[in-house]
């Protein structure tokens, strides 16, 4: 099982001193969201048990395997269901604990209720606070059973559940009918998937008779041992205030582990800590008895004594559950409770034994799950303790389960059972991934998902060019990292393939698929110039580069021109894609704008080195158009034109332009400079007799502006042809109709 | 689907004596509470008797004390109205109703007990 | 036997809204939030309709809903329609904590 606690401090006089704290003893626990552990996660479940909603709790990690829940703020925060999740992949496991309101009106006899599949489950509400109205008997928040109020027997409502079967686990509660569903009783019902002693997916195999409380897992056979025991069978107990499948956590606070509730995965449940017993676990053992939520009994003999953590504690020349045992029986010694192998290894057991007479090689022997007994192939005496050497044939998957190492002699017999793991070396179901790549080195996520066994101990990177028949090169990384191979040669494809490796003497799995990476081309050397541009508009400019000479191919595809604006903080990039180029107009630029310029060769994604920057400054845009024009003719060659000076002028004006057009005619239009830019009227001079004219006209200060709405007039009838138009007195360059 | 089956209604003298059985389906029957309501003609709903799922405690309308006794076979799932000493004011359309909490989810179609000489 | 008072009928047009009242003592609708409301269409069975004073189990509609105020429990129906029309029953539940055995009391 998964080596998971969820602990809550039952000091329930302040609800803000109150906390849940989740402990993982698995390697790589909650490391957060790296593929190799999950998170551990705690949190309140509000799906069956819902509280008034209070301020958010507040989640603390206190390294990678513990987290702490706190910020309770009232009694009722308190009440209902927690749940701790930690765990990998298939071990992936749910803690739950179930709180109660120490002042509800019905209290459970017991919390947590483990019962076999097909027992009858007796769950006991006590009536703390009592009301003479329906007690409701739900399951997983449903309406389940009703009670009149006169079915108590002996202060307390029970429900009777026969025939369990594990679809009835969950949360059950009780409650008058009346009453806040706060001031329930709630209760967590656990149904093994098998019969008593039975485990296994058709509940063939034997439980290993779990000692001391512990709980037989109905999915591997495991004991899920009760806080403060350790061992395959629950065999052994910690020392004072420590819990954990290997005695590794240690209670908080000088107490120890008095006020607290131990949460362990399925189907163990909820209790106190050895030691320790009552709804708050704050009651010491009464003599005689020993354990989680002081459960059992000593019944020492032999002179032995009971301890309320251990049991019995037995005199010298004595031992046994009871100290039923004595010293001259043969006695297995320092047995591991578990052991791990690596799939297809051939390890060596060893087993060691005392006693009188003095065990020999012959006595000692090795059953395998199956039955399959092994002698040992060497032995080692020595004064106090003969130890036996087992060579296992190649390990199957199979070989998985107890094992037991017995030991036989005139004096009596004694066994060991312990646990054999086999796991299998990881393989790479995936190939890696690439995330960065150069022309002479890629860099690698080796991070896939695997079959098999974790945790993970080495990660190999094997790559060579791809349709290459040379070695295999090797580099060995840390799982965690992304790795970076070098020294390759550009725009070449690599074949690349993930081997992982798990703890122990074979670990070493199979090579995951392989994946072809490619490295990138070489990167582009040359730096081009600028050989000069020029303004073609105030948002316009041309720009032209050289490329120094070399022999040879040119290496890149185009170019990148590149516009920094720095009153902005913008830059503007355009690609030419001709690596033949040598000049590009840029349009849709800021007029009036202070531009950084500079150019560089690109091949493939990679650029070469930038050009020494040149300044550009782009003439500002002009001001906006003169307002209100409006044409009149005066003679049949004269027009006088009206108008009013543009709004919000930037600057003074040094000039208008009057562009004059016949209409419908197909010949370029006349622009005729106002050098008198304080006027706001002129007339056009030398203009045809009857004939139809269109004029516009514009300002311009350090640029030219924008052009005025089109006015229409037609001169006057029956004059000589012109010679064309003026203003003024100043004669054009050319007549309107040529 | 929950249904809830009366029958054992018809025609009895003052003073007589009928009984009358509710078939439920469709839920568990043994953990619901039950009860008798009944509606005499053209006036309104009358509780008669309620019963509890362990058959240990029953509760009645003042009207019917001491003459109705109600009961139930879980295993048959079957709720039952032993009617003695039958009234005029009997004369009514007992229904068979399944009590969720403290109200009446669901209802039978109810039968017809008429008390008349 | 207590009966809870109803109004003798109430009327209205497809469309509006009308509201039934449902008056008891501080013994049933007064002391508990266990008011529920009953549908009834001439011989038919009756159907929940309100449960604990305002809510609706599922299926029906949201045109339906109940409320409570000291001694008295009303039943509204806004955007009346013609399948509407029928009889309605308000009911109270009074517990043993007041009387000596668990009772129900209805509108009539």
């Known amino acids: 099982a998964v080596d998971l606690t969820l602990l809550a401090n039952l000091r329930l006089t302040d609800p803000q001193r109150f906390f849940l704290t989740c402990v993982s003893g698995e390697a790589g626990a909650g490391r957060g969201s790296d593929a190799w552990g999950p998170p551990l996660l705690l949190e309140k479940d509000d799906r069956i048990v819902r509280t008034p909603p209070g301020p958010p709790l507040r989640l603390a990690r206190n390294g990678s395997h513990q987290v702490t829940l706190r910020g309770f703020s009232k009694p009722s925060d308190l009440v209902g269901v927690f749940s701790c999740v930690g765990g990998a992949g298939a071990r992936r496991t749910r803690v739950i604990y179930v709180h109660n309101s120490p002042g509800a009106h019905l209290l459970p006899d017991k919390v947590t209720h483990t019962v076999n599949k097909g027992d009858t489950a007796v769950l006991s509400a006590r009536v703390h606070k009592e009301k003479q109205t329906d007690v409701i008997w739900k399951s997983n928040g449903s309406y389940f059973y009703t009670l009149d109020w006169h079915e108590a027997q002996d202060g307390r409502f029970l429900l009777q559940l026969p025939n369990v079967q594990p679809p009835s686990s969950g949360i059950y509660s009780a409650t008058y009918l009346e009453a806040s569903p706060l001031g329930s009783a709630f209760f967590r019902l656990i149904v093994r998937g098998c019969g008593a002693g039975r485990w296994g997916p058709g509940c063939t195999k034997e439980c290993p008779g779990c000692l001391h409380g512990g709980v037989c897992h109905d999915h591997d056979g495991e004991c899920v041992c009760p806080p403060g025991f350790t061992g395959t069978r629950c065999e052994q107990a910690c020392r004072e205030g420590r819990f954990g499948q290997s005695c590794q956590e240690q209670c908080p606070g000088i107490s120890g582990c008095r006020g607290l509730t131990f949460c362990l995965p399925d189907p163990y449940g909820c209790s106190c800590g050895s030691g320790w017993r009552g709804s708050q676990c704050q009651e010491a053992c009464a003599p005689g008895h020993f354990g989680a939520d002081c459960r059992l009994q000593c019944q020492c003999q032999n002179g032995g004594t009971c301890d309320r953590f251990s049991g019995c504690v037995c005199p010298s020349g004595w031992h046994g559950v009871h100290c039923e045992k004595s010293d001259r029986i043969p006695q297995i010694l320092n047995m591991a409770s578990e052991l791990e192998f690596n799939l297809e290894t051939m390890p060596r057991i060893n087993c060691a034994a005392a006693g009188n007479p003095f065990p020999v090689r012959g006595s000692i022997e090795l059953r395998k799950p199956d039955g399959t007994v092994l002698l040992s192939t060497k032995a080692i005496v020595e004064p106090e303790k003969t130890t036996a050497e087992f060579e296992v044939p190649r390990l199957v998957l199979a070989d998985s389960g107890f094992w037991e190492c017995r030991v036989s002699t005139s004096g009596g017999q004694d066994s060991r059972r312990f646990k054999v793991n086999v796991k299998v070396p990881p393989v790479p179901l995936a190939a890696p991934r690439l995330l960065t790549k150069q022309s002479r080195q890629l860099v690698v996520s080796p991070l896939v998902s695997f079959s098999g066994d974790g945790p993970i101990s080495t990660v190999r990177l094997h790559y060579r060019p791809q349709d290459s028949t040379m070695d295999w090169s090797t580099i060995v990384v840390d799982p965690s990292e992304n790795v970076t191979l070098m020294n390759l040669r550009p725009k070449t494809g690599y074949s690349v393939r993930v081997q992982l490796s798990r703890p122990g003497e074979g670990g070493e799995g199979a090579w995951g698929p392989p994946t072809l990476m490619t490295t990138d081309c070489p990167e582009p050397l040359l730096q081009p110039w600028l050989e000069g541009w020029h303004v073609e508009g105030t948002d316009r400019l041309r720009v032209s580069w050289s490329l120094p000479l070399v022999p040879g191919p040119l290496v890149g595809d185009g170019f990148l021109l590149r516009l920094w604006d720095g009153t902005r903080g913008q830059e503007r990039r355009e690609n030419v894609s001709s690596p033949q180029a040598r000049t590009a107009l840029l349009t849709g630029l800021t007029p009036g704008t202070h531009y950084q310029l500079d150019v560089q060769l690109y091949h493939c994604t990679l650029l070469g080195p930038a050009s020494p920057p040149a300044h550009v400054l782009l003439p500002p845009s002009g001001p906006p158009a003169p307002r209100h024009l409006h044409a009149q003719a005066l003679s049949d060659s004269e027009i006088q034109l009206t108008w009013k000076h543009p709004e919000a002028l930037p600057g003074p004006i040094s000039k208008y332009v009057v562009e004059v057009q016949v209409a419908g005619g197909a010949g370029d239009p006349l622009w005729i400079d106002v050098d008198r830019p304080e006027e706001t009227s002129t007339i056009i001079r030398g203009l045809n007799a009857s004939t139809r004219y269109l004029f516009r006209m514009r300002a311009s200060i350090q640029g030219l502006g924008d052009w005025s709405n089109t006015v229409e007039e037609s001169t006057l009838g029956n004059g000589l042809q012109a010679e064309g138009p003026v203003q003024e007195s100043r004669a054009a360059e050319e007549g309107l109709d040529q | 689907e929950v249904q809830l089956l009366e029958s054992g209604g018809g025609l009895v003298q003052p003073g007589g004596s009928l009984r009358l059985s509710c078939a439920a389906s469709?839920?568990?029957?043994?953990?619901?509470?039950m009860g008798w309501v009944r509606q005499a003609p053209g006036r309104g709903l009358e509780w008669v008797s309620s019963i509890y799922p362990s058959g240990g405690w029953t509760h009645y309308a003042d009207s019917v004390k001491g003459r109705f006794t109600i009961s139930r076979d879980n295993s048959k799932n079957t709720l039952y109205l032993q009617m003695n000493s039958l009234r005029a004011e009997d004369t009514a359309v007992y229904y068979c109703?399944?009590?969720?909490?403290?109200?009446?989810?669901?209802w039978g179609q109810g039968t017809l007990v008429t008390v008349s000489s | 036997q207590s009966v809870l008072t109803q109004p003798a009928s109430v009327s209205g047009s497809p469309g509006q809204s009308i509201t039934i009242s449902c008056t008891g003592t501080s013994s049933d609708v007064g002391g508990y939030k266990y008011v529920s409301w009953y549908q009834q269409h001439p011989g038919k069975a009756p159907k929940l309709i309100i449960s604990d004073v305002n809510n609706r189990p599922s299926g029906v509609s949201d045109r339906f809903s109940g409320s409570k105020s000291g001694n008295t429990a009303s039943l509204t129906i806004s955007g009346l329609q013609a399948e509407d029309d029928g009889d309605y029953y308000c009911s109270s539940y009074a517990s043993s904590s007041y009387t000596s055995s668990t009772t129900w009391v209805f509108g009539g």
């Open positions: 469709g839920f568990t029957f043994s953990s619901y509470k």
């Open positions: 109703a399944r009590v969720l909490l403290h109200y009446f989810d669901y």
